[in-house]
């Protein structure tokens, strides 16, 4: 808390500038008015105060609005938004992709803070839904955003909004989160066909039923081993030697050098010797 | 996953009409096919009409063709095989199926082994 001093003479401040980096701590909380800093909050980014001198002006928008912060004044909070904690951004209302976007560019480069989590968390509640807007926005700023949230938000996602993951958006989602988003990349994608459609679903494919790897393996797809090895294992067991064979095509080679790893492993065991070894490939059950 | 029952089979005398019904539950996609299928006492599974869902491919088998008609219904998430002028040798365990991802509207003909979600049947009996 800075003790509250009068404003020595002359040194009122009647605009945001570069003069007031010369202000001691008291002396910016004596001499610059909450409601100027409010209105012209796109300045402070401009200037170069000290952390200090940061906790100061932050403390005085805590006064003025003490039940959070306009938006108008969040979207220009810049390099002032380190200093929020996870309480002060609950108390936010975020509704501008616009002001999102300003709030993660202040933090771009590094991982995933508590704020920032916060700060996207209230911003998609607000929302109601994962618009393919905000979708397309996080994963920009946070490739393995997706992956971050729990299947009970990710079945908040609509289909439309599955146009903006990417391949590596996925790459860090367990079995669980692909069998939320598989269903919503069948629904987004099911007017593509042909190998369009295969390039598209394929990095969804970790939440694909062994119905679906069936279907797939008698249309010459020619699913490359990384695919494979994100198939859910309760959905490789079952297809047979022949399946898996059509399912890869000239990459069933493959197979070999991921004999011990798993699903691949444990489907090994579940076939025949004699179905193995007509790959080829000294696989041993 | 995809749930399949059928119904609308019964008895009728040559010449007669009937109208299958296959319910659908579960996900059903624009790039899925349904089909559907019979089995007369004795013989193999043969295909007789599909379709691809999100349109634009039916086929039929010559044996039926011009007396069958194959449709769907998006918003019940139905499928429907008219029957008219039904002859004996028609008559046969009818089954809906489904592939459930088709790369290409070609790949619905119905064909037994191309088909992974089956319903459990319903019986058509045509009497001369």
């Known amino acids: 808390e800075v003790e509250k001093t009068a404003c020595p003479s002359g040194k009122k401040a009647r605009e945001i500038d570069e003069s007031l980096i010369f202000y001691k701590k008291w002396e910016l909380e004596a001499c610059v008015d909450a409601a100027l800093l409010a209105t012209q909050m796109d300045r402070v980014n401009a200037i170069p105060f000290t952390y200090e001198q940061l906790d100061v002006l932050k403390h005085k928008l805590d006064e003025l609005y003490p039940q959070g912060y306009p938006e108008s004044v969040i979207q220009h909070l810049g390099y002032l938004f380190l200093k929020m904690s996870p309480e002060d951004i609950r108390k936010w209302n975020v509704t501008s992709l616009e002001t999102l976007k300003a709030l993660l560019e202040v933090n771009k480069g590094h991982e995933m803070s508590p704020q920032v989590a916060t700060l996207i968390d209230r911003f998609v509640k607000g929302r109601g839904q994962l618009d393919k807007d905000t979708l397309d926005t996080l994963t920009a700023f946070y490739p393995g955003y997706l992956c971050s949230l729990s299947p009970e938000e990710l079945s908040s996602v609509p289909p439309s909004s599955i146009w903006a993951v990417r391949p590596q958006d996925l790459d860090t989602c367990d079995p669980r989160q692909l069998d939320v988003l598989y269903p919503k990349a069948r629904l987004a994608f099911q007017n593509m066909n042909g190998s369009e459609y295969f390039v598209k679903i394929q990095s969804f494919l970790g939440g694909a039923p062994t119905e679906d790897l069936k279907a797939l393996s008698q249309q010459n797809v020619s699913m490359d081993l990384a695919t494979f090895m994100k198939l859910r294992t309760d959905a490789v067991l079952p297809l047979t030697v022949a399946e898996v064979q059509k399912l890869l095509g000239p990459h069933v080679e493959g197979l070999k050098a991921e004999e011990r790893h798993r699903p691949v492993r444990d489907w090994i065991l579940r076939q025949r010797q004699d179905d193995l070894d007509t790959l080829g490939l000294g696989l041993q059950g | 996953q995809v749930q399949l029952v059928e119904s609308g089979g019964g008895s009728v005398q040559a010449g007669g009409s009937l109208r299958l019904s296959c319910a659908a539950s579960g996900n059903v996609y624009n790039n899925m096919c349904m089909g559907w299928f019979r089995q007369a006492p004795g013989k193999e599974r043969e295909g007789v009409a599909s379709m691809y869902v999100g349109g634009g491919y039916t086929y039929y088998d010559d044996s039926v063709k011009g007396r069958f008609t194959i449709s769907r219904d998006n918003a019940k998430n139905t499928l429907y095989l008219q029957m008219n002028s039904l002859k004996p040798e028609d008559t046969a365990m009818y089954y809906c199926?489904?592939?459930?991802?088709?790369?290409?509207?070609?790949?619905?003909?119905?064909?037994?082994?191309?088909?992974?979600?089956w319903g459990q049947g319903t019986q058509v009996t045509v009497s001369s």
């Open positions: 199926a489904a592939i459930s991802i088709a790369l290409t509207r070609e790949f619905c003909a119905p064909i037994v082994s191309r088909y992974n979600y």
